[in-house]
């Protein structure tokens, strides 16, 4: 009879993780009589993955009856497979002896890849708020990965992103693989809607990449404009001033009126409207009483946005005497100039 | 059914011969090892011989030279041809099936009665 | 040769009673050690290999342990039916060799 040969006909296999993986090997003779063992990798530091002999393996099971002794087929199936098992599992065949079995013979091995399934992809932006113009940078991570091979890709409002940096964890060989990818976005006054979008392709996703979004409303801030106005007079002697707050995003807004450099009023933004672009208008008036002032008021609209320091428009009131007009509920009130904002 | 059934056995004359047969059913026959075991009455058990998958065969001490053991597959059939019998092999003859992977025994026959007397 | 030495000879238990039966061997063995039952006028049955596997069919009150050189067999609750002369043998290396034998008898 021909020595036996120890034949594991699958010289590679690739599953799923969690599934289960069948390593086949076969036996071509039943002499000489031994036990036959699995193992992972090779040389002094192999690991034992199953004994015929003795030995407890919960996530082990063999295809055929291995009690017997007219059994050739040796194939086992490893239950609940993780990317940890990937690796190369060899059957090798032992002589029965003492006080230790003999290695008799070594099957060619079997390489086991585990396709592992990406982490959903995690978008994050930076920590402060920035303003348009400013160019900001986007990270996306995503774990646990195997094979090595994967495409990232970075879009704005469906727009495809070129200025990205992305690198993939370790270098070497891993059971699993990380991906790790900043991307550089310049930001506009109309992104409060915007999109940053990481998208991932795997093998394991089937051309179904898995997508991490993160809104620029998170990161956006638009600062205010103003503009102060003076409206016709509503009464006798006062005069109507407005702010008008425009395009602003996020909504937090504080907003302060001096008079001469005095507070008159502080008020917090409520009742905005918003526009299209997701920004916010908002607009506070005073009533100034002229016949309180003898000299030309300087009003003064400061806005404090989102914690920012603040800004601020001025407008001058003119005092002068006018007659008034006959048959009029109200006086004209002094002459007003506006004078350019300071 | 898994079976070995014994036959042969008698009353022999010391330095005769005699061949005992056990017939298996039941399971591959050549796909196993066999063995012949002996007890001797009010004695222990007796490791006689045993035949390979692929004809190899060994014998203790006691036997060698004297007994052969053989193997007819086709039949389902294991042989012990004893020689030069002498009164110390009188026991009861079994045989087993080497049925666990590691060739311990699984499977024994009823045994038959060998007898060496003047 | 391998010697394989039994201890007790003889043995006697009640029912319901845990016994252990053990078989030394005169150099390793390794594991490779089975026990046998046998009841007058009877074939012996195999009841363990490689010292702790049960073979098919027998109960779980049968256990086997050892390596090497010593090794046991423990009857976990005697019945009437345990009864009988229990063998060890190794087979590692020919000849197989068997212990002479424990009697276990009803007390």
């Known amino acids: 009879e021909e020595e036996l040969q120890v034949i594991q006909p699958d010289k590679s296999i690739s599953v799923a993780a969690g599934e289960s993986a069948t390593l086949h090997c076969t036996v071509t003779s039943l002499i000489p009589v031994g036990p036959i063992q699995w193992f992972r990798g090779a040389g002094p530091g192999r690991e034992l993955i199953y004994n015929q002999k003795e030995g407890h393996f919960p996530r082990v099971t063999t295809v055929s009856d291995l009690t017997k002794r007219n059994n050739m087929d040796f194939s086992i199936r490893i239950s609940n497979i993780t990317p940890a098992d990937a690796g190369t599992y060899y059957c090798v065949k032992f002589r029965k002896g003492s006080p230790d079995d003999v290695e008799f013979k070594s099957g060619a091995g079997t390489e086991l890849s585990v396709r592992a399934k990406p982490s959903a992809p995690v978008v994050s932006g930076p920590a402060a708020r920035a303003t348009p113009q400013h160019t900001v940078s986007f990270t996306c991570e995503s774990h646990g990965f195997s094979p090595r091979d994967i495409t990232l890709k970075w879009f704005k409002n469906g727009n495809e992103l070129s200025d990205f940096q992305t690198n993939v964890d370790p270098a070497g060989d891993s059971v699993s693989y990380s991906i790790h990818s900043t991307a550089k976005v310049v930001l506009t006054r109309e992104d409060v809607h915007s999109q940053v979008i990481c998208e991932v392709a795997h093998v394991t996703l089937q051309g179904d990449p898995l997508r991490g979004t993160a809104n620029l409303s998170e990161t956006i801030r638009v600062p205010p404009t103003l503009e102060v106005t003076q409206q016709p007079v509503r009464a006798e002697n006062q005069v109507n001033v407005t702010c008008q707050v425009r395009k602003f995003y996020p909504q937090r807004l504080q907003l302060t009126w001096l008079e001469n450099g005095n507070v008159s009023r502080t008020e917090t933004a409520s009742t905005l409207t918003e526009n299209k672009d997701g920004t916010y208008n908002w607009m506070s008036w005073l009533l100034v009483n002229v016949s309180a002032h003898r000299d030309d008021v300087k009003l003064t609209c400061q806005v404090e946005h989102d914690g920012q320091p603040a800004v601020s428009k001025s407008h001058d009131l003119k005092v002068s005497a006018h007659p008034k007009e006959q048959g009029s509920n109200t006086a004209p009130g002094p002459a007003l100039a506006s004078a350019a904002p300071l | 059914e898994v079976q070995l059934v014994e036959s042969g056995g008698g009353l022999v004359q010391p330095g005769g011969s005699l061949r005992l047969s056990c017939a298996a059913s039941?399971?591959?026959?050549?796909?196993?090892?066999m063995h012949w075991v002996r007890q001797a009455t009010g004695k222990g058990l007796e490791w006689v011989s045993v035949?390979?998958?692929?004809?190899?065969?060994y014998y203790p001490g006691s036997v060698k030279g004297r007994f052969t053991i053989s193997r007819e597959n086709a039949k389902n059939s294991l042989y012990l041809q004893m020689n030069s019998l002498r009164v110390g092999d009188t026991a009861v003859y079994y045989c087993?099936?080497?049925?666990?992977?590691?060739?311990?025994?699984?499977?024994w026959g009823q045994g038959t009665m060998v007898t060496v007397s003047s | 040769d391998i010697q394989m030495t039994q201890s007790p000879s003889s043995l006697s238990a009640s029912i319901g009673d845990k016994v252990t039966i053990t078989c030394r061997a005169s150099?390793?063995?390794?594991?490779?050690l089975a026990w046998f039952q046998q009841k007058p006028g009877k074939a012996p049955k195999s009841l363990i290999y490689?010292?702790?596997s049960l073979q098919s069919g027998v109960p779980s009150k049968f256990s086997g342990s050892g390596s090497g050189t010593d090794f046991t067999l423990t009857i976990s609750s005697l019945q009437p039916e345990d009864f009988a002369t229990y063998y060890c043998?190794?087979?590692?290396?020919?000849?197989?060799?068997f212990g002479q034998g424990t009697k276990l008898e009803i007390k």
């Open positions: 043998q190794q087979y590692v290396s020919y000849p197989y060799t």
């Open positions: 150099q390793d063995i390794n594991n490779y």
């Open positions: 035949i390979g998958i692929a004809g190899d065969t």
């Open positions: 087993a099936r080497g049925g666990s992977w590691d060739d311990a025994f699984d499977i």
């Open positions: 490689t010292a702790s």
């Open positions: 039941g399971f591959t026959f050549s796909s196993y090892d």
